[in-house]
Amino acid sequence: DITPSVPPASYHPKPWLGAQPATVVTPGVNVTLRCRAPQPAWRFGLFKPGEIAPLLFRDVSSELAEFFLEEVTPAQGGSYRCCYRRPDWGPGVWSQPSDVLELLVTEELPRPSLVALPGPVVGPGANVSLRCAGRLRNMSFVLYREGVAAPLQYRHSAQPWADFTLLGARAPGTYSCYYHTPSAPYVLSQRSEVLVISWEDSGSSDYTRGNLVRLGLAGLVLISLGALVTFDWRSQNRAPAGIRP
């Protein structure tokens, strides 16, 4: 809790906290945190988790307060909450805190992973699904083919991943992906590791079939040798004819 004096939720419901232009921004951007109360308030406070004293105050007789973070640095990223209060509530009494707003200030987002489902080797005519997975929700994911500047496919996703379907005939190739924020200022991830999709071609099938034949023949040779050794061993251990113990 922000203070020991937070009343039950039924008394003073929590406000809403949002960020403009976005919750993920590049360093140097001016960010406005907007705290909106469900009723007119007198004072608003912006809090960092674990701190009892507000980071910033705003004294406004309305339902909305704006907290300006100018030219943000990565150090200003993190969790924020806001509360509001009215003069008739008594000293130190604040509303329920808003839900946590996570502000991320970074030049680039972490590298996504790119994997093929069910695997990177495709049979003729079979489709393959590529999953580009990042760490953040509500991002735009973009799939690229090596040697081509424009995105092959793109997909906005509420999940921290997006799936792309490649048609079997066109699937083989080298792929990579990125994800980025869906609104300005656009923050782009690092590029994923490349993923090579290849044919399960007839050559490799013939090679595998050849190996199976060789293994089979080797097995037969081993069985034959085993039989000969056993036969020889039993011959040597059998008593010669005409000799009695």
């Epitope: 735009s140 500047a149 980025h180 869906p182 300005a184 656009y186 923050v187 590029r191």
Partner: antibody, heavy 128, light 108 residues
Framework: EVQLVQSGAEVKKPGESLKISCKGS????????IVWVRQMPGKGLEWMGS????????RYSPSFQGQVTISADKSISTAYLQWSSLKASDTAMYYC?????????????????????WGQGTTVTVSS | EIVLTQSPGTLSLSPGERATLSCRAS???????LAWYQQKPGQAPRLLIY???SRATGIPDRFSGSGSGTDFTLTISRLEPEDFAVYYC?????????FGGGTKVEIK
Amino acid sequence: EVQLVQSGAEVKKPGESLKISCKGSGYSFTSYWIVWVRQMPGKGLEWMGSIYPGDSDARYSPSFQGQVTISADKSISTAYLQWSSLKASDTAMYYCARQKITMVRGVIITPLDGMDVWGQGTTVTVSS
Amino acid sequence: EIVLTQSPGTLSLSPGERATLSCRASQSVSSSYLAWYQQKPGQAPRLLIYGASSRATGIPDRFSGSGSGTDFTLTISRLEPEDFAVYYCQQYGSSPLTFGGGTKVEIK
């Protein structure tokens, strides 16, 4: 003035080939996708595909993949839509439009604006 | 692919009235990637709104867009005679790009 000017109306027979054009002017042709949209008589809009004029790399709607070919010649700021063998069901109005290319750190990302300039449309009639 | 369903199919209103057009997506669409177009008979479509709520250049302020997730709305605050047309929503955040089926706003 920014504009996209499309080639004139065409009347063709089934099985014939056709190539229609869309010429951009008044802006940097390679800074925008060129998008092709079909509108069949009395129907809505359908995205056929888009081309990045920078390297003439085209993207197709699954419904139109293999049915049409989209190409571009950036030296004359022109994009093309072509059919190798027309069908009666290709009778429609075809529009080209532009959509801004967004780049971050030299990477082309998801388009972040709508189609802000449209050609006047090319009517294609296929009938025996 | 994301399917966009527009409602109503036809809206019969008088000049000066308020028009509210709905566009519902089969899956979540970021508001950054939703556009509205107007098309009059015999003309090419015209971009009205992009990013769900940003007016395109030269579009009068009687046109406004709102919404997020799967529900988006185009509002024309006071219909002018030139506003009677067909309106399409479109998402361009996931390939393939898709359009709604359109809403015709006609004079009552």
